[in-house]
């Protein structure tokens, strides 16, 4: 063991260093003192530290540690925050365009149903947005409300235009008839299935991203314990007390200290890994009816088909409803007039051709790839922080918490620490309450993500087959019944080049009747302006 170098006889270097931490020199001894009151930097001989200095070092050490932790997570935090914002806005844009397409469909095909239809469409898509953002909304309710509201207007304006304007009187009966007579066939059920599945996944995806931010924020702002503060002080500052200003801590010693300090945080690792892998599974399954972009941008077509279905059955429906709603008070007679053979168009849907260019789907996969590079973030934190703070290379001529050593020995260091505090005890304390809470939240979201990613959950509800669709009409290779119909085959190009949209929002949204409104043309929808050079951290 080499003898320690003679301490600075005047404590001059220590004084000048300490002054940078704490202006004023009243706490620094002018010459080395016995230091019998010290609790952390226990001296082997005279020392240039006082109890007050030690306290200041402890505070500084803990602050340093917090800053190191924050800088360690900065890139990851930015990645998730940025993506959560981008995806949330992109989903809003999808909803807005889906609403515009639907309004345009009504304006072009059923002008007599406007502005009422715009109102109902607006209500529906408002609920879609609220649902995605986590509101207490039920998808079946919003689909039912859409069709309940639409049918009276369809009946009074399209099927029976002779009725007076004040049709509120028979609305009640018509709303009931809509469900009882299944006037839209299976379209409401189909839309419920598609919308609920795609929105559920979208909502959980956003929830998961927001929880990711919460996890990083929690660990980012951890307050380290006094025990940890003492360990950090011994590692970073106690050497100064001996006048060893240029000595760096041993790398191995740093790892031991960091593992002790971060024992609670590292417990997140298992759940963090599972979080990223579960999120990847979810993203891999977000296609066809599990892709809200696909579902919502095709909704106008399905709604159009549903109205055509009503029109095809108009003759029988008008007769039935005429009897049923002649006296809107006599609701109880409804079932007596149930039509026997409403026309059922088995081949109601043809599939839209979708050209995927820069879609939300590819952005999601890109995010997952970046997140996977952070899969070991928590287990690697102690090592990361040591590599980003001054440590001696190769563990030679370095500080081990008590003295300058030629080579670091973990066993010697542990023995030397025992009379200070028990490192094992520090680890055994378990994570802080905030860390335990965030682990519980991670467990919960992981459970949700796993549930959503179950292979059996990926099968389109077979009960659609029992309700009038021929087996095969909604097959796996046909984008699950999403898309255009018959003569007006829809071609959705470049399905949501959403980054361009973030830079340039179309002004057409929410403007029923505005001449510049985006309108689905007979044969194609040119989806968005592509500005091309949008700057994004995702690119």
């Amino acid at each position: 063991q080499p003898p320690p170098p003679p301490p600075d006889a005047t404590c001059h270097q220590v004084r000048s260093f300490f002054q940078r931490l704490q202006p004023g020199l009243k706490w620094v001894p002018e010459t080395p003192v016995p230091g019998s009151d010290l609790q952390v930097c226990l001296p082997k001989g005279p020392t240039c530290c006082s109890r007050k200095m030690e306290e200041k070092y402890q505070l500084t050490a803990r602050l340093n540690m917090e800053q190191l932790l924050q800088s360690a997570s900065m890139e990851l935090k930015f990645l998730i925050i940025q993506n959560a914002a981008v995806f949330q806005e992109a989903f809003e844009i999808v909803v807005r365009h889906a609403k515009n397409y639907t309004n345009a469909m009504f304006k072009n095909n059923y002008p007599s149903l406007t502005p009422q239809a715009f109102e109902f469409v607006g209500e529906f898509f408002t609920d879609v947005s609220l649902y995605i953002l986590g509101s207490d909304i039920n998808v079946d309710d919003m689909v039912n409300e859409l069709f309940d509201s639409l049918f009276p207007v369809i009946y009074t304006q399209l099927m029976n235009p002779g009725l007076p304007d004040s049709a509120l009187d028979i609305n009640e009966c018509l709303r009931g008839a809509r469900r009882d007579l299944k006037v839209f066939g299976n379209f409401p059920k189909l839309i419920m299935t598609q919308v609920s599945k795609s929105l559920q996944v979208t909502r959980i995806f956003l929830q998961a991203l927001n929880l990711g931010i919460e996890v990083i924020n929690t660990t980012d702002h951890l307050k380290f314990s006094k025990d940890c503060g003492r360990m950090l002080t011994r590692m970073w500052y106690c050497s100064y007390c001996q006048g060893l200003m240029m000595v760096k801590p041993c790398g191995g010693y740093c790892n031991v200290v960091m593992q002790g300090c971060m024992a609670g945080v590292v417990e997140i690792d298992k759940y963090w890994r599972e979080y990223i892998l579960s999120l990847e599974e979810l993203v891999n399954g977000m296609y066809r009816i599990y892709d809200m972009e696909n579902v919502l941008l095709g909704l106008f077509s399905t709604i159009h088909d549903s109205i055509q279905y009503v029109q095809k059955n108009a003759g029988k429906l008008t007769t039935t409803i005429g009897k049923l709603c002649a006296h809107s008070q006599q609701r109880q007679y409804r079932s007596a007039y149930y039509p026997e053979d409403l026309f059922i168009d088995k081949k109601v849907l043809k599939v839209a051709h979708v050209e995927h260019e820069e879609t939300l789907s590819s952005r999601r996969r890109e995010l997952i790839q970046k997140l996977k590079s952070f899969i070991s973030f928590y287990s690697a934190l102690p090592g990361y922080i040591c590599s980003h703070s001054p440590v001696a290379e190769n563990d030679t001529l370095c500080w081990n918490g008590q003295e300058l050593v030629e080579r670091y020995s973990q066993k010697a260091a542990r023995n030397g620490m025992k009379n200070q505090f028990n490192l094992h005890e520090l680890k055994m304390k378990g994570p802080e309450p905030v860390v335990s809470q965030i682990i519980d939240k991670l467990k919960h979201i992981n459970q949700l993500l796993r549930t959503m990613s179950m292979p059996k959950g990926r099968v389109l509800d077979k009960n659609l087959d029992e309700e009038g669709f021929e087996s095969g009409d909604c097959g796996d290779d046909e984008d699950e019944c999403i898309g255009g119909s018959g003569d007006g085959m829809i071609k959705v190009k470049n399905q949501l080049r959403f980054l361009a949209e973030l830079a340039y929002d179309l002004d057409v949204d929410d403007a029923p009747g505005n001449s510049q409104q985006a309108t689905p043309k007979d044969n194609e929808i040119s989806t968005f302006h592509n500005l091309g050079n949008v700057h994004s951290p995702l690119k």
């Epitope: 715009f118 509101s135 079946d140 309710d141 919003m142 469900r179 403007a511 029923p512």
Partner: antibody
Framework: EVQLLESGGGLVQPGGSLRLSCAAS????????MSWVRQAPGKGLEWVSA????????YYADSVKGRFTISRDNSKNTLYLQMNSLRAEDTAVYYC?????????WGQGTMVTVSS | YELTQPPSASGTPGQRVTISCSGG????????VNWFRQLPGTAPKLLVY???QRPSGVPDRFSGSKSGTSASLAIGGLQSDDEADYYC???????????FGGGTKVTVL
């Protein structure tokens, strides 16, 4: 004939709670979204909360979020508004109305006074 | 209030009175407008829905219209029992809530 009848109003101290009810008749209650709208003395109308036909979806004005809870019992044709942590500014006549975006039928209202 | 109405309007019996309701692109500009009337001490009653539709029982003296971000309610052949407060309402896409005008008190001189 559509009828809506509110009850449950009264005088309550700040921080207190009250539960309003609205009994509906003359229409298929479960087919309609329902709302609560209030009117402070001498003031205009303010939407408070809404609920979908099945009760699966609920909506609140920012001013009451976290304090008020809307619910319904379709078997009893009744709409409810549970009001907690009441404040002086919640003093108003509370109307129940049929609909969520536009309101075609209204009840006569029940007065809620929050005062110490 | 998100929607702006004149606080008062008046006319003599038989005259035509128009009440305006001004909003923005997120409410009137993108959604339909409904009008209510509230007689003193009573509940509001629907007069016009979907900009210009009248429920049965509402006389055709009442008519609604909408243009851009403004709407108006016209009362033709003013009668003494038309004295009431009149409110407009529209859904607001930004607030995700229905918004009301402050009300217009109509006086028959």
């Amino acid at each position: 004939e559509v009828q809506l009848l509110e009850s449950g109003g009264g005088l309550v101290q700040p921080g207190g709670s009250l539960r309003l009810s609205c009994a509906a008749s003359g229409f298929t209650f479960s087919s309609y979204a329902m709302s609560w709208v209030r009117q402070a003395p001498g003031k205009g109308l303010e939407w408070v909360s809404a609920i979908s036909g099945s009760g699966g979806s609920t909506y609140y004005a920012d001013s009451v979020k976290g304090r008020f809870t809307i619910s319904r019992d379709n078997s009893k044709n009744t709409l409810y508004l549970q009001m907690n942590s009441l404040r002086a500014e919640d003093t108003a006549v509370y109307y129940c109305a049929r609909g969520k975006r536009y309101f075609d039928y209204w009840g006569q209202g029940t007065m809620v006074t929050v005062s110490s | 209030y998100e929607l702006t109405q004149p606080p008062s309007a008046s006319g003599t019996p038989g005259q035509r009175v128009t009440i305006s309701c001004s909003g923005g692109s997120s409410n009137i500009g993108s959604n339909t407008v409904n009008w209510f009337r509230q007689l003193p001490g009573t509940a509001p009653k629907l007069l016009v829905y979907f900009n210009n539709q009248r429920p049965s029982g509402v006389p055709d003296r009442f008519s609604g219209s909408k243009s851009g971000t403004s709407a108006s309610l016209a009362i033709g052949g003013l009668q003494s029992d038309d004295e009431a407060d009149y409110y407009c309402v529209a859904w607001d896409d930004s607030l995700n809530a229905p918004v009301f005008g402050g009300g217009t008190k109509v006086t028959v001189l």
